[in-house]
């Protein structure tokens, strides 16, 4: 690597993937081992942001970019730049403090994350309910009772809808 | 409950092997990193080592890189670590504990146990 | 390796009080920042992880904030099982932790 010439601030000439290493006259150096630059002129480089435990690695890091993560099978980015992992729980289930739970009746949740939320209430859009809700799925709500032909019958519909059970913190 | 106890721990001359244990229990050992952690006499909190699920992934802080070993037993839900070429330096508590496989964070502990290196 | 610099290293203070101690990274670490708390002799507790998250059992008297390179843990009100040694630590790279702070009685 060159020795910079600029006239205003030597460093400004070195590229990306190097830093301007003042204890050998402000050459250009390349970034060490496990560390990066993404922009030019820099007097240091970033370490490498290291992808273990619940993180693996999506992008291997490089003199001139950061490693990215994101978390092995089984968990979930959650938060800027995936600063944390989540369990998965099935559909069907929440997360609580103590591990994955069933959906209470009346509640569903068709991910493998978030909360169980209540089944849609038909009645207040003035619909019926054409297909049962279940602890995977929301219920399908159909014409109201009154678009019905005489002789049809719906589906009698689901008890109130509660809030989701969440274990004490 | 969770539970990380301690063993293994006492006086070494310089140069001298130690071999550390942990025993783990209230949880599923094989779904969780461990790690050794050590604090010197009066000092702060110092990353020394951690090891993946299985075992087959291991690091290491760089001083004591190729005289410390990270290794686990999972059928036995036991965490170890081997050290050779003690120095005085190493003396201090050695904590094991659980990586919460959330976001880098510790959250459970063992009691510690105080290796010391000394003639 | 990331260096993690605490402030103050120790402090005086009373029941009720509101404390708060900076933890500053030697490069930004995002949000892979936890707390720690440590009495004499025992091993530490995690009181927060990932700058902000209030570990399952901590009274809600603690909290943290911050992100990238700069990080406080406040205690609200000072209670008496709160004296202690508290540490900050970077899970973004090879683990490092700060120095300590030792809250004391005034």
């Known amino acids: 690597f060159e020795r910079t010439r600029s006239l205003q601030d030597p460093c400004s000439n070195c590229p990306a993937g190097t830093f301007c290493d003042n204890n050998r006259n402000q050459i250009c150096s390349p970034c060490p081992p496990n560390s990066f630059s993404s922009a030019g002129g820099q007097r240091t480089c970033d370490i490498c942001r290291q992808c273990k435990g619940v993180f693996r690695t999506r992008k291997e890091c490089s003199s001139t970019s950061n490693a990215e993560c994101d978390c092995t099978p089984g968990f979930h980015c959650l938060g800027a730049g995936c600063s944390m992992c989540e369990q998965d729980c099935k559909q069907g289930q929440e997360l609580t403090k103590k591990g994955c739970k069933d959906c209470c009746f009346g509640t569903f949740n068709d991910q493998k994350r978030g909360i169980c939320r209540p089944w849609t209430n038909c009645s207040l859009d003035g619909k019926s309910v054409l297909v049962n809700g279940t602890k995977e799925r929301d219920v399908v709500c159909g014409p109201s009772p009154a678009d019905l032909s005489p002789g049809a019958s719906s589906v009698t519909p689901p008890a109130p809808a509660r809030e989701p059970g969440h274990s004490p913190q | 409950q969770v539970q990380l106890v301690q063993s293994g721990g006492g006086l070494v001359q310089p140069g001298g092997s130690l071999r550390l244990s942990c025993a783990a229990s209230?949880?599923?050992?094989?779904?969780?990193?461990m790690d050794w952690v050590r604090q010197a006499p009066g000092k702060g909190l110092e990353w020394v080592a951690d090891?993946?699920?299985?075992?087959?992934?291991?690091y290491y802080v760089d001083s004591v890189k190729g005289r410390f070993t990270i290794s686990r037993d999972n059928a036995g839900n036991s965490l170890y670590l081997q050290m050779n070429s003690l120095r005085a330096e190493d003396t201090a508590v050695y904590y094991c504990?659980?990586?919460?496989?959330?976001?880098?964070?510790?959250?459970?502990w063992g009691q510690g146990t105080l290796v010391t290196v000394s003639s | 390796a990331i260096q993690m610099t605490q402030s103050p290293s120790s402090l005086s203070a009373s029941v009720g009080d509101r404390v708060t101690i900076t933890c500053r990274a030697s490069?930004?670490?995002?949000?892979?920042l936890n707390w720690y708390q440590q009495k004499p002799g025992k091993a530490p507790k995690l009181l927060i992880y990932?700058?902000?998250s209030l570990q399952s059992g901590v009274p809600s008297r603690f909290s943290g904030s911050g992100s990238g390179t700069d990080f406080t843990l406040t205690i609200s009100s000072l209670q008496p099982e709160d004296f202690a040694t508290y540490y900050c630590q970077q899970s973004y790279s090879t683990p490092t932790f700060g120095q300590g702070t030792k809250v004391e009685i005034k």
């Open positions: 990932a700058a902000s």
């Open positions: 504990a659980r990586d919460a496989m959330r976001g880098g964070d510790l959250d459970y």
């Open positions: 090891i993946n699920k299985d075992g087959g992934e291991k």
């Open positions: 490069q930004s670490i995002s949000s892979y």
């Open positions: 209230g949880f599923t050992f094989t779904n969780f990193w």
